[in-house]
Interface confidence: low
C-alpha cells in the first residue's frame, strides 16, 4: 500500500534502533572512505528528520523517496570530489539514476587498513562507557569493507558482537573469553559476506529469474513438504528483499525481511515443521534462524520423477505451455528430492533439461529423444561428487595450512597473471572449504563445498573484474554463474605465461616477521610461494616442498637467533641462492 | 486428505450447455493441481481439460478445445467445468481428480492423480 511518507513508514516499521543501524549501514557502503564521526552525524539528522515526518507526514520533504533524502544527503558532504574523484559526478543527475551511479561506485576491495580487533581490555572499557557508539564502529567499520553485506544481517551479528562483549566483560580473564567468541561471530561475518556479494552478483548480471531459480532450488531442499505454489511465493518474496539489499534500499529490503519472517512463522503448517524455535525469538534472531534452518523430512511417498518430466507423453506440450513455470516445477521437484546436492548443481541440471527439451521437442520423436535425459545427469553429478572426495581427501592429509598451499599451487598455475594477495586471499578462503565442509557428514559435503566454493570464487571474479589481467579467469567469470566453479576446476597451467624473472627482494624477510601473529606469518610465506610459482610456474610439488621446508626452517632459525636482524641479513641471501638452485 | 463432490450433470440435446461442479474441502482448492477426467462406458478414464495449483495455467484434452472452459473460485474452493456445443461423444461420467502439490498437470494419466470424486453423469441426447 502507498504511504505519503516512506521514511516514516519504515522508521514506525523498524524502530529507531534498528532504523539508525541501517542508514548508517547504507551510509558507510555509498561512502567507504568516510570516518564514522562523519556517517553519524548524517545519521543523525535522517533520524531527526525521520521523526518529523512521523509527527507530520504532510512535513515538508516527507514525501520524498529514501534515495532522493539519502542522495541529497551524500551529495551535500562538503569535499565530496577531493575524497571520492569521479564519484561526486553522481551528484549531477536525477533519481533514480543517481542511485545506480552510486552503485556501480562502490568497491569490492576498498583501499582500507584490515579492521584491527582491539585488546580486550580497551575493548571492554570503550564498550561499557559507550555500548552505542561501540556497535556503531562496529556497523561502520564492516559495512565499509563490504559494501554488500546483507544490512539486516549485520544488525544481527552487531547483535551478537553485544551478546559476547556484554558476558565477557565482566570475567576476569577477558581476553580469553572473547577471543573464540568474537573469532567465531568474525568467520560466519566473512562468509555471509562472500555469500551475499554472490547473490548481489548473481542479481546484476543475470537479473530476478536467475536468482529466482536459485531460491527455488534452495528453498525446496529446505521445505520439501511445501507446495510448489507456497515454495515460488518464498522465492519470490527472497528475491525482492535481496534485490532491494543488493540495490542500495536497505530500510524496505529489513522490513520486507521481518515481514517474510512473520509470514513464514504465520504459515508453518504448509511450510515446514522445523520452524518453531525460530519462530519464538525476537526478529533479528528469528529471520536470522530462518535463514539457517535445517532441511525438513523429505515426505516418504514422493513418486519418481521420471513419471511427470520423461515418461509423460504430454512432455513437451507443457513445456510449450508454460515454459519457466513447467521447468521452476523440474526444478521444485528435483531439488526437495536432493537436499544432497549443491544448489549450483540443481541449476545445473534443470539446465540441461531445459536443453534437452529445447533439441527433442523439435524432433519428429520427442519422448524418444528425451527418454535418457536423466541418465544423461550422472556425469554432471559425478563430476562434483568426485571434486569433493578428492578435495576432502586432501585436505584430511594437508591439514589446513597445508591444503590452502596446494589451493594456492594449483590456482597461482591456472592464473599466473593475476595479483600475488588476490590470489592468496583466494587460495586461503577456498583453502578452508576443508574446515568447513569435510569434516560435515557425507550428504551434506557436496552442497557445503559447491556452494561455498562457487561464493569465494565470485570474489575472485568481481575482483579481477576491476582490473581484468588474465584471459582465462575472465572466460570463467563471463560465463554463468553455475558453471563457474567447474571452469575453474577444469582449468589447466597457463602455458601462455611468461614466467616473472627471479627477484631477491621479493624473497628478503626481516625480523619484523617474528613479531607477527600467526596468520599474518602464514600469509607473508603464502606469497612467497605464490611468488615462487610465478617464477617457475612447472615447479614440481617436490620441489616447492624443499623450498618452502627450507624457508620455513631459516625464519625458525632467525627468529630465535639473538641477534635477529643479523641473521636475517646473512642468512636470507643464502637462502635466496638455495631456492633459485632447487628451483633450477 | 482431500475430499471432491462433483454435481451439476444431466440430460442434454446436442449444441446444449452444462456446467459442472466439483466442491473440495480437506485441502484449498488453489494449492493443488486439479483435473476433469471423464470415462465412457467400457472405455478407461480419459483426460478433458485442467487447472495448475497456484498459477492458473489450464490445459485441455483436443477433443474439447474451443467448447470446454476450466475454471476456479478460490472463495468457494470449487472447480468449474463450462461446456458448450455438447456433442453425443461427449456423453460419459464425468470425475475431477486433485493431486496436492502439484503446479502443473503434467501429466494427463489417471493413475496420478490420488484424490476423486465420485462422479457425474453427463448425457448428450436428442
Known amino acids: 500500500e502507498a504511504h505519503k511518507s516512506e521514511i516514516a513508514h519504515r522508521f514506525k516499521d523498524l524502530g529507531e534502533q534498528h532504523f539508525k543501524g541501517l542508514v548508517l549501514i547504507a551510509f558507510s557502503q555509498y561512502l567507504q572512505k568516510c570516518p564514522y564521526e562523519e556517517h553519524i552525524k548524517l545519521v543523525q539528522e535522517v533520524t531527526d528528520f525521520a521523526k518529523t515526518c512521523v509527527a507530520d507526514e504532510n512535513a515538508e520533504n516527507c514525501d520524498k523517496s529514501i534515495h532522493t533524502l539519502f542522495g541529497d544527503k551524500l551529495c551535500a558532504i562538503p569535499k565530496l570530489r577531493d575524497n571520492y574523484g569521479e564519484l561526486a559526478d553522481c551528484c549531477a543527475k536525477q533519481e533514480p539514476e543517481r542511485n545506480e551511479c552510486f552503485l556501480q561506485h562502490k568497491d569490492d576491495n576498498p583501499n582500507l587498513p584490515p579492521f584491527q580487533r582491539p585488546e580486550a581490555e580497551a575493548m571492554c572499557t570503550s564498550f561499557q562507557e559507550n555500548p552505542t557508539s561501540f556497535l556503531g564502529h562496529y556497523l561502520h567499520e564492516v559495512a565499509r569493507r563490504h559494501p554488500y553485506f546483507y544490512a539486516p544481517e549485520l544488525l544481527y551479528y552487531a547483535e551478537k558482537y553485544n551478546e559476547v562483549l556484554t558476558q565477557c566483560c565482566t570475567e576476569s580473564d577477558k581476553a580469553a573469553c572473547l577471543t573464540p567468541k568474537l573469532d567465531a561471530v568474525k568467520e560466519k561475518a566473512l562468509v555471509a559476506a562472500v555469500r551475499q556479494r554472490m547473490k548481489c552478483s548473481s542479481m546484476q548480471r543475470f537479473g530476478e529469474r536467475a536468482f529466482k531459480a536459485w531460491a527455488v532450488a534452495r528453498m525446496s531442499q529446505r521445505f520439501p513438504n511445501a507446495e510448489f505454489a507456497e515454495i515460488t511465493k518464498l522465492a519470490t518474496d527472497v528475491t525482492k528483499i535481496n534485490k532491494e539489499c543488493c540495490h542500495g534500499d536497505l530500510l524496505e529490503c529489513a522490513d520486507d525481511r521481518a515481514e517474510l519472517a512473520k509470514y513464514m512463522c504465520e504459515n508453518q503448517a504448509t511450510i515446514s515443521s522445523k520452524l518453531q524455535a525460530c519462530c519464538d525469538k525476537p526478529v533479528l534472531q528469528k529471520s536470522q534462524c530462518l535463514a539457517e534452518i535445517e532441511h525438513d523430512n523429505i515426505p516418504a511417498d514422493l513418486p519418481s520423477i521420471a513419471a511427470d518430466f520423461v515418461e509423460d507423453k504430454e512432455v513437451c506440450k507443457n513445456y510449450a505451455e508454460a515454459k519457466d513455470v513447467f521447468l521452476g516445477t523440474f526444478l521444485y521437484e528435483y531439488s526437495r528430492r536432493h537436499p544432497d546436492y549443491s544448489v549450483s548443481l540443481l541449476l545445473r541440471l534443470a539446465k540441461k533439461y531445459e536443453a534437452t527439451l529445447e533439441k527433442c521437442c523439435a524432433e519428429g520423436d520427442p519422448p524418444a529423444c528425451y527418454g535418457t535425459v536423466l541418465a544423461e545427469f550422472q556425469p554432471l553429478v559425478e563430476e562434483p561428487k568426485n571434486l569433493v572426495k578428492t578435495n576432502c581427501e586432501l585436505y584430511e592429509k594437508l591439514g589446513e595450512y597445508g591444503f590452502q598451499n596446494a589451493v594456492l599451487v594449483r590456482y597461482t598455475q591456472k592464473a599466473p597473471q593475476v595479483s600475488t594477495p588476490t590470489l592468496v586471499e583466494a587460495a586461503r578462503n577456498l583453502g578452508r572449504v576443508g574446515t568447513k565442509c569435510c569434516t560435515l557428514p557425507e550428504a551434506q559435503r557436496l552442497p557445503c563445498v559447491e556452494d561455498y566454493l562457487s561464493a569465494i570464487l565470485n570474489r575472485l571474479c568481481v575482483l579481477h573484474e576491476k582490473t581484468p589481467v588474465s584471459e582465462k579467469v575472465t572466460k570463467c567469470c563471463s560465463g554463468s554463474l553455475v558453471e563457474r566453479r567447474p571452469c575453474f576446476s577444469a582449468l589447466t597451467v597457463d602455458e601462455t605465461y611468461v614466467p616473472k624473472e627471479f627477484k631477491a627482494e621479493t624473497f628478503t624477510f626481516h625480523s619484523d616477521i617474528c613479531t607477527l601473529p600467526d596468520k599474518e606469518k602464514q600469509i607473508k610465506k603464502q606469497t612467497a610461494l605464490a611468488e615462487l610459482v610465478k617464477h617457475k610456474p612447472k615447479a614440481t610439488e617436490d620441489q616447492l616442498k624443499t623450498v618452502m621446508g627450507d624457508f620455513a626452517q631459516f625464519v625458525d632459525k632467525c627468529c630465535k637467533a639473538a641477534d635477529k636482524d643479523n641473521c636475517f641479513a646473512t642468512e636470507g641471501p643464502n637462502l635466496v641462492a638455495r631456492s633459485k638452485e632447487a628451483l633450477a | 486428505e482431500v475430499q471432491l463432490l462433483e454435481s451439476g450433470g444431466g440430460l442434454v440435446q446436442p449444441g446444449g450447455s452444462l456446467r459442472l461442479s466439483c466442491a473440495a474441502s480437506g485441502r484449498y482448492i488453489d494449492e493443488t493441481a486439479v483435473a476433469w477426467f471423464r470415462q465412457a462406458p467400457g472405455k478407461g478414464r480419459e483426460f478433458v481439460a485442467g487447472?495448475?495449483?497456484?498459477?492458473?495455467?489450464?490445459y485441455y484434452a483436443d477433443s474439447v478445445k474451443g467448447r470446454f472452459t476450466i475454471s476456479r473460485d478460490n472463495s468457494k474452493n470449487t472447480l468449474y467445468l463450462q461446456m458448450n456445443s455438447l456433442r453425443p461423444e461427449d456423453t460419459a461420467v464425468y470425475y475431477c481428480g486433485a493431486r496436492p502439490g502439484r503446479p502443473l498437470i503434467t501429466s494427463k494419466v489417471a493413475d496420478l492423480y490420488p484424490y476423486w470424486g465420485q462422479g457425474t453423469l453427463v448425457t448428450v441426447s436428442s
Open positions: 487447472i495448475g495449483g497456484g498459477v492458473d495455467i489450464t
